[in-house]
C-alpha cells in the first residue's frame, strides 16, 4: 500500500481550508478523548480510478467519496482519518485530513473526496473513515467502513495498467488445445515479444471431478527473435487412463518484468459427450 | 491449476468438535486469504468468517464467535477450520473457498453431520 | 446485518431463451455484488463481482447490471448447462451475505 507520488495533497475546498497529512492510523484523540465529537460519515462509497504517476505510469487506485450529515456536530469536527486495509497482509495505511478552518452549515451538503491510495490488482480492502476528534471509549461510533474489492489484470482497464503491464497482461497467447490419436493432445499458442522460456502446465481430471488424475509439465526453450508472435506448437502425451479426460493446459510464462510471478493463460478440454442410451450392438445378424 | 482440496465427511455427536482441512495448490498460498462458507442441506450460503494466509489474521460472523477457530499450516499451504459444541443445526456441507470478499475457487465441500 | 432477497424462487425457461434473475438488498451497497452458479452436488462457481465484472472463464451471455439496491443477472441464451441454482451475495460490509438462490429449470 502506498501513495500515489508524494506531491502536495489538497483536501481544501470553497469555505474550508484544510491539509492532507500523513497518520499513523492512531489519532492523538484516542489517547486524549474529547467531550464532544462529530457524528459519523454519511454515504461512504469506494470506486476504482485510475491515476498517472508523473513519470506517467498508470495505477488503479481507491477512490474514496463521502459526505457529512446535516446535524450541529459539524461544529466541533476537526478534521478525518482515512484508513486503507488490505485483508489478506493487514497492511494499512493512513492520511488525515486536518481542517485548519471551523465548518459551517452552508446550502449544500459537504461532500470530501480522496482518491491517492494506490491498489492492487486482484487484492481486496476495507475503507474506513473516520471523523475526528474520535469518539470517547463509550461513546457512538463515528466511523463508516466499506469494502472494496481490485479487480484482476483481465478487467479491459486494468490490463493497461503498469502494474499488469509489468506482469504480462498484453500477452494473449490464443491457446488452442485438440485431442489427437493415441492419448495425445496438441497444444498451440502465440509466442510473446520477449526471448524468454514458457511452462506448459498439463492437469487432467475425471468427468466432474475436480481431484486430478494426471499431471504432466513440459518445458518450452526462449525463442529467437525472428519467432517472436509466431505460434509454437507442443504435443503432450497422457496417460492411458479409462475417465482421465477433462484436460486443463495452463502457459506460464517468465517475463523479465515478472520472474516466477507473471500472468498464466490456460484453456480446457472438455470430455467428449457420453450418448445418453447407446444403441445394443446384437451378437449376430437375423438371417430374415 | 488453483485446487482446495478437504478432508472427507465427518459424523459427530452434539457437543463434539469438527476439524475441517483444505489444502491449497496451485497458486503462492499466502498471497490470498481463505474463507469458509456452509450450506445446510437444501439451503442457502452461509458465510463463516476467513483466515489471512498471509499471518493468521481472522474475522468471523458474530453468529459463531466464540465456537469456530481457523488456523492455517503455510508449511503445507493448509487451513483448517474447527467448529466446537456441536449442534444438530450445524449439520451442513462446509465449503472453504480462496479470497476474503468475493469466492474464485472453491473446495469440493465437506459433509458434516451432527446426530445422536 | 445486510438481508439479500432474491425473486423468483423458481424460473422455468426453455433452452435458448433469456432469463433474468434479481436480487435485491436491504440497504444501498453500491456495486459490492457477486454471482455464483452452483449445481447439484457440487461447490458454488464465480460467475460475476462488482455487479457486471465477469470472472475468468465465464461465458459472455451472463450479465450482470443494477446498482444500490436492485440488481440483476441475465442469461442471454440459456444453454442445458446453465440449468441451475444462483445465489447474489454482498460483500460490500461485513458480515457477508447471500441471497436464498433462484433456481433456474428447464421448462
Known amino acids: 500500500l502506498r501513495l500515489l507520488d508524494h506531491r502536495a495533497l489538497v483536501c481544501s475546498q470553497p469555505g474550508l481550508n484544510c491539509t492532507v497529512k500523513n497518520s499513523t492510523c492512531l489519532d492523538d484523540s484516542w489517547i486524549h478523548p474529547r467531550n464532544l465529537t462529530p457524528s459519523s460519515p454519511k454515504d461512504l462509497q469506494i470506486q476504482l480510478h485510475f491515476a498517472h504517476t508523473q513519470q506517467g505510469d498508470l495505477f488503479p487506485v481507491a477512490h474514496i467519496e463521502w459526505t457529512l450529515q446535516t446535524d450541529a456536530s459539524i461544529l466541533y469536527l476537526e478534521g478525518a482519518e482515512l484508513s486503507v486495509l488490505q485483508l489478506n497482509t493487514n497492511e494499512r495505511l493512513c492520511v488525515r485530513f486536518e481542517f485548519l478552518s471551523k465548518l459551517r452549515h452552508h446550502h449544500r451538503r459537504w461532500r470530501f473526496t480522496f482518491s491517492h491510495f494506490v491498489v492492487d490488482p486482484d487484492q481486496e480492502y476495507e475503507v474506513t473513515v473516520h471523523h475526528l476528534p474520535k469518539p470517547i471509549p463509550d461513546g457512538d461510533p463515528n466511523h463508516q467502513s466499506k469494502n472494496f474489492l481490485v479487480p484482476d489484470c483481465e478487467h479491459a482497464r486494468m490490463k493497461v495498467t503498469t502494474p499488469c503491464m509489468s506482469s504480462g497482461s498484453l500477452w494473449d497467447p490464443n491457446i488452442t488445445v485438440e485431442t489427437l490419436e493415441a492419448h495425445q493432445l496438441r497444444v498451440s499458442f502465440t509466442l510473446w515479444n520477449e526471448s524468454t522460456h514458457y511452462q506448459i502446465l498439463l492437469t487432467s481430471f475425471p468427468h466432474m471431478e475436480n481431484h486430478s488424475c494426471f499431471e504432466h509439465m513440459h518445458h518450452i526453450p526462449a525463442p529467437r527473435p525472428e519467432e517472436f508472435h509466431q505460434r509454437s506448437n507442443v504435443t503432450l502425451t497422457l496417460r492411458n487412463l479409462k475417465g482421465c479426460c477433462r484436460h486443463q493446459v495452463q502457459i506460464q510464462p517468465f517475463f523479465s518484468s515478472c520472474l516466477n510471478d507473471c500472468l498464466r493463460h490456460s484453456a480446457t478440454v472438455s470430455c467428449p459427450e457420453m450418448p445418453d442410451t447407446p444403441e445394443p450392438i446384437p451378437d449376430y445378424m437375423p438371417l430374415w | 491449476q488453483v485446487q482446495l482440496v478437504q478432508s472427507g465427511a465427518e459424523v459427530k455427536k452434539p457437543g463434539a468438535s469438527v476439524k475441517v482441512s483444505c489444502k491449497a495448490s496451485g497458486y503462492t498460498f499466502t498471497s490470498y486469504g481463505i474463507s469458509w462458507v456452509r450450506q445446510a442441506p437444501g439451503q442457502g450460503l452461509e458465510w463463516m468468517g476467513w483466515?489471512?494466509?498471509?499471518?493468521?489474521?481472522?474475522k468471523y460472523a458474530q453468529k459463531l464467535q466464540g465456537r469456530v477457530t481457523m488456523t492455517t499450516d503455510t508449511s503445507t499451504s493448509t487451513v483448517y477450520m474447527e467448529l466446537r459444541s456441536l449442534r444438530s443445526d450445524d449439520t451442513a456441507v462446509y465449503y472453504c473457498?480462496?479470497?476474503?470478499?468475493?469466492?474464485?475457487?472453491w473446495g469440493q465441500g465437506t459433509l458434516v453431520t451432527v446426530s445422536s | 446485518e445486510i438481508v439479500m432477497t432474491q425473486s423468483p424462487a423458481t424460473l422455468s425457461v426453455s433452452p435458448g431463451e433469456r432469463a433474468t434473475l434479481s436480487c435485491r438488498a436491504s440497504q444501498s451497497i453500491s456495486t459490492s455484488l457477486a454471482w455464483y452458479q452452483q449445481k447439484p452436488g457440487q461447490a458454488p462457481r464465480l460467475l460475476i463481482y462488482g455487479t457486471s465484472t465477469r470472472a475468468t472463464g465465464i461465458p459472455a451471455r451472463f450479465s450482470g447490471s443494477g446498482s444500490g439496491t436492485e440488481f440483476t443477472l441475465t442469461i442471454s441464451s440459456l444453454q442445458s448447462e446453465d440449468f441451475a441454482v444462483y445465489f447474489c451475495?454482498?460483500?460490500?460490509?461485513?458480515?457477508?451475505?447471500f441471497g436464498g438462490g433462484t433456481k433456474v429449470e428447464i421448462k
Open positions: 451475495q454482498q460483500y460490500d460490509i461485513w458480515p457477508l451475505t
Open positions: 483466515i489471512s494466509a498471509y499471518n493468521g489474521n481472522t
Open positions: 473457498a480462496r479470497k476474503q470478499l468475493v469466492f474464485d475457487y
